[in-house]
Structures are given as C-alpha cells and as structure tokens.
Interface confidence: low
C-alpha cells in the first residue's frame, strides 16, 4: 500500500511542467517503493538496485518506456509522440 506524501508542481517553464512527488509505501521484504502504471507501488528491490526502471512498468498502458541513457530515470512515450520524463533522486 502506498500514499503520496508531497506533490509540488512548477509550470514556470513554457511547454514543460516539472512535478516533484514523494510517496510513502508499506512494502513486503524484498520490495521497495516504486512506480507502476504511473502510480506509487511496491516493486522488486532488484529493479531499483539495477536501475532497470522500465521493469517496474512505470508507464500507462499503451505508452512506451525507455531508460534514460545514464539510468537516472525513464521516459514514457504516448502513442501521439508526447514524452514524459521521470528522474529518480
């Protein structure tokens, strides 16, 4: 089970919205807070350790997931071509 703790939005840059979200999850042993289908979820801890973010299925159904080149996050590409970038900190 997960709950969103904080959600900050910054729309000051044209054509770009930056959102910072923190979630708190109660996960079983071997799992850790992550993102599945664009919502906070408990995921296999090995995914976080290896930074194979797309293995969490972080994007919505029908979107394409791609790792950022230095594995600092992932992108979700919508069928129309719009790209949402998520970085992990």
């Amino acid at each position: 089970t997960c709950e969103i703790v904080t959600l900050d939005r910054d729309s000051s840059q044209p054509r770009r919205t930056i959102a910072r979200q923190t979630a708190r999850c109660a996960c079983r042993k071997g799992q850790i807070a992550g993102t599945t289908r664009a919502r906070p979820a408990c995921v296999d801890a090995r995914i976080i350790k290896t930074k194979q973010w797309c293995d969490m299925l972080p994007c919505l159904e029908g979107e394409g997931c791609d790792l950022l080149i230095n594995r600092s996050g992932w992108t979700c590409t919508q069928p129309g071509g719009r790209i949402k970038t998520t970085t992990v900190s």
Epitope: L68, I69, N70, T77
Partner: antibody
Framework: SVEESGGRLVTPGTPLTLTCTVS????????MSWVRQAPGEGLEWIGI??????TYYASWAKGRFTISKTSSTTVELKMTSLTTEDTATYFC????????????WGPGTLVTVSS | ELVMTQTPPSLSASVGETVRIRCLAS??????ISWYQQKPEKPPTLLIS???NLESGVPPRFSGSGSGTDYTLTIGGVQAEDAATYYC????????????FGAGTNVEIK
C-alpha cells in the same frame, strides 16, 4: 575486442553491409553502436542495438540504415541508396548500459562511395 | 533534434596549463554525456561517462563536470601526449533524442 569489416569502394546507389565482430564479451548483455567519420570531419552517431535487439537511430539515418544482430558475436550495419556523402570510416563501439559512454571501439572500416 | 554545441573548435596550450572544453546541449540531457579523445588515424577512446565518471586507466588530470545543459571537460596540467581532438557525446534517451556528438575541439600543445 571489436573489429569491423566489409568496407570497400562502391558506386552511388549501391547497397552495402558492414559487419562488426566481437570477442571477449557478449552481445546478449552489451549495447553496440555504429558511428561514422567522414575524412577530416567529426564523429557522427548512426544508431544502437540493445541486447534485446531493439534498435534506435539518429534521425538522419532512419530508413536508410539498419542495424541487426546476426549471431552471438556479430552485428551488421546495412546501408542502402549510398551517396558520396556516405564516404567515411565506420566504427562499431560497445556502449555501456549504465551511461552514454562507448568504452571499446574497433579500428574502423573505410567505405568510399564514388562514381 | 538534440544539438551539442562544443567550444572552442581549437586551442593551443603550454604543458602544465589547465584546459577547459565546454559542451552546451540544446535541451536538458540529465548528465547523459561522455567525453572522448581521438588521435590521428585512431578510433576514439572514452575518457569520461555520465558527465563526471572517469574511465578506468584514464589519468586523473582529466575531469568532467556539469549538469542540465552545460558540461565541461577539464584537463588539469596538460601534457604533450594530450594533443588530440576531443569530442563530447550527449543524449538522454535513445528513443527520443538518440546520441549527438559535438563538433570536436582540436588541442595543440605548444
């Protein structure tokens, strides 16, 4: 190690396939990129093939260049509709899956397109 | 399309000087940048990846820094053997930006 082969003199419009042969590591766990360099010019990224065989290309290379894995030790670059602008040394390089770094390069193979 | 603007195109330095080469990306590349050294008739060799991670075997006088769109390769105490052309390579996602090289910087040692 990485070694390219197949470079030669061809006439415009001719298709050509280059081969990259690797040893000492596995294509099932490493990314491979193709990069080219025209005489006296800078480097130009062509595209990449993932261990899963997913491929991505530079926008200018889409449609005319195709990267494929032909065995556990070889990757090919198929080029069609070659023009004199494609004259270059073609390099194959192992790309780290942790960053954009290409940490092992072949010596390159020269492709000359001329009528 | 991602553009990597590399400056200066060429520079001349004396042994022991500090050399800085800058690459400016046309959009945020999330530290997805690497730096290469190339000598005539040789393939490039990787110096730095992930903006600041020094490749094994590369002398510590080479360092990388930067974030967002602005990145720098620094050679502290340049040596005669550092005469070469240096390239940055940037991109954050193969599917969206792919990778783009900077135009290169030719470093001459006086």
């Amino acid at each position: 190690s990485v070694e390219e082969s197949g470079g030669r003199l061809v006439t415009p419009g001719t298709p050509l396939t280059l081969t990259c042969t690797v040893s000492g590591f596995s294509l099932s766990s490493d990314y491979m990129s193709w990069v080219r360099q025209a005489p006296g010019e800078g480097l130009e990224w062509i595209g990449i093939i993932y261990p899963s065989t997913t491929t991505y290309y530079a926008s200018w290379a889409k449609g005319r260049f195709t990267i494929s894995k032909t065995s556990s030790t070889t990757v090919e670059l198929k080029m069609t509709s070659l023009t004199t602008e494609d004259t270059a040394t073609y390099f194959c390089a192992r790309g780290s899956n942790w960053s954009s770094g290409m940490n092992l390069w072949g010596p390159g193979t020269l492709v000359t397109v001329s009528s | 399309e991602l553009v990597m603007t590399q400056t200066p195109p060429s520079l001349s330095a004396s042994v022991g000087e500090t050399v800085r080469i800058r690459c400016l990306a046309s959009e945020d590349i999330y530290s997805g940048i690497s730096w290469y050294q190339q000598k005539p008739e040789k393939p490039p060799t990787l110096l730095i990846s992930g903006a600041s991670n020094l490749e094994s075997g590369v002398p510590p006088r080479f360092s990388g820094s930067g974030s967002g769109t602005d990145y720098t390769l620094t050679i502290g105490g340049v040596q005669a053997e550092d005469a070469a052309t240096y390239y940055c390579l940037g991109g954050y996602s193969y599917s969206s930006t792919g990778l783009t090289f900077g135009a290169g910087t030719n470093v001459e040692i006086k």
